[in-house]
């Protein structure tokens, strides 16, 4: 279930925008980055898609938001929330957050000025 996140811009607008896009390619891209091509992460068939392709698909999805710049933090928070339970330890959580904060730059978007990724009731 989606919980209410701290909003940077127009809250209802950002929520609708994040709801409308498919964040799976971003989740897959970041998992690929932190786990490489390890076979242990078999919940997604990530070996068949090159990392750069996955990154472009992720950027493509983020670009579908009406205002990606304004709602980027909400998108990053949702990705974090979606993947939180899959992150096995604290080190993996930190790696995931690091990669997540690099995502806007990888996609040539401006990074949000402030974005708190401590979502999911402290689990992550």
């Amino acid at each position: 279930m989606r919980r209410e996140r701290g909003r940077q811009g127009d809250s209802s607008s950002c929520e609708r925008q994040v709801d409308r896009v498919n964040l799976k390619p971003c989740e897959q891209h970041i998992m690929q980055r932190i786990m490489g091509e390890q076979e242990q992460y078999d919940s997604y068939d990530i070996r068949s898609t090159r990392s750069s392709d996955q990154q472009q698909r992720c950027c493509d999805e983020l670009n579908e938001m009406e205002n990606t710049q304004r709602c980027m933090c909400e998108a990053l928070q949702q990705i974090m929330e979606n993947q939180c339970d899959r992150l096995q330890d604290r080190q993996m959580v930190q790696q995931f957050k690091r990669e997540l904060m690099n995502l806007p730059q990888q996609c040539n978007f401006r990074a949000p000025q402030r974005c708190d990724l401590d979502v999911s009731g402290g689990r992550c």
Partner: antibody, heavy 119, light 112 residues
Framework: EVQLVESGGGLVKPGGSLRLSCAAS????????MSWVRQAPGKGLEWVSY????????YYADSLKGRFTISRDNTENSVYLQMSSLRAEDTGVYYC????????????WGRGTLVTVSS | QSVLTQPPSVSGAPGQRVTISCTGS?????????VHWYQQFPGSAPHVLIY???QRPSGVPDRFSASKSGTSASLAITGLQADDEADYYC????????????FGGGTKLTVL
Amino acid sequence: EVQLVESGGGLVKPGGSLRLSCAASGFILSRSSMSWVRQAPGKGLEWVSYISSTSSHIYYADSLKGRFTISRDNTENSVYLQMSSLRAEDTGVYYCARKTNGAWFLDLWGRGTLVTVSS
Amino acid sequence: QSVLTQPPSVSGAPGQRVTISCTGSSSNIGAGSDVHWYQQFPGSAPHVLIYGNNQRPSGVPDRFSASKSGTSASLAITGLQADDEADYYCQSYDYDLSGSWVFGGGTKLTVL
């Protein structure tokens, strides 16, 4: 120079087909989402179709669904609009335009190509 | 009929201030979507005049400004000049339409 150049317009009979091309230069097309916008003579702008950078999102104006098909070939730096079952009301200048990265507006436009549907 | 409503024409004398309105609904401007404005001279392609409700691209004079409130937006031009005579279009994003792109019908600005 960063530019878009449309081609493929011309005179076609009602019921006929036409394929418009949009050649991009000066920027990386594969990272850009693109749209076609048309303008009937003496009328306003009407959005026609949209294709995202990886082609995973394709949209059409409701009035055109089923008759027009947008596609792209990033290796050829081109975007296309295949138009079929053309009608007189499809007459106008067709513009190719680039969606800006991170926001929902068109920051680069071609000069347009004229499509005339007449018997 | 356009999803966004603009007056078909406005006019003003050189040096005057004119405004062009753009009225939408709760599924586009009223839903928080940004409004963008394009200028089009006869025989030319449109180009962005204002983006993100009130941002001017480099090269656009500060005589052009825009604002947004509720379900509508407006473009203001101060110190009107002869070469401002053109068509002006607003554009936004609509959550209820599959394509999302929506334009206003356009406003012809005549400098008297």
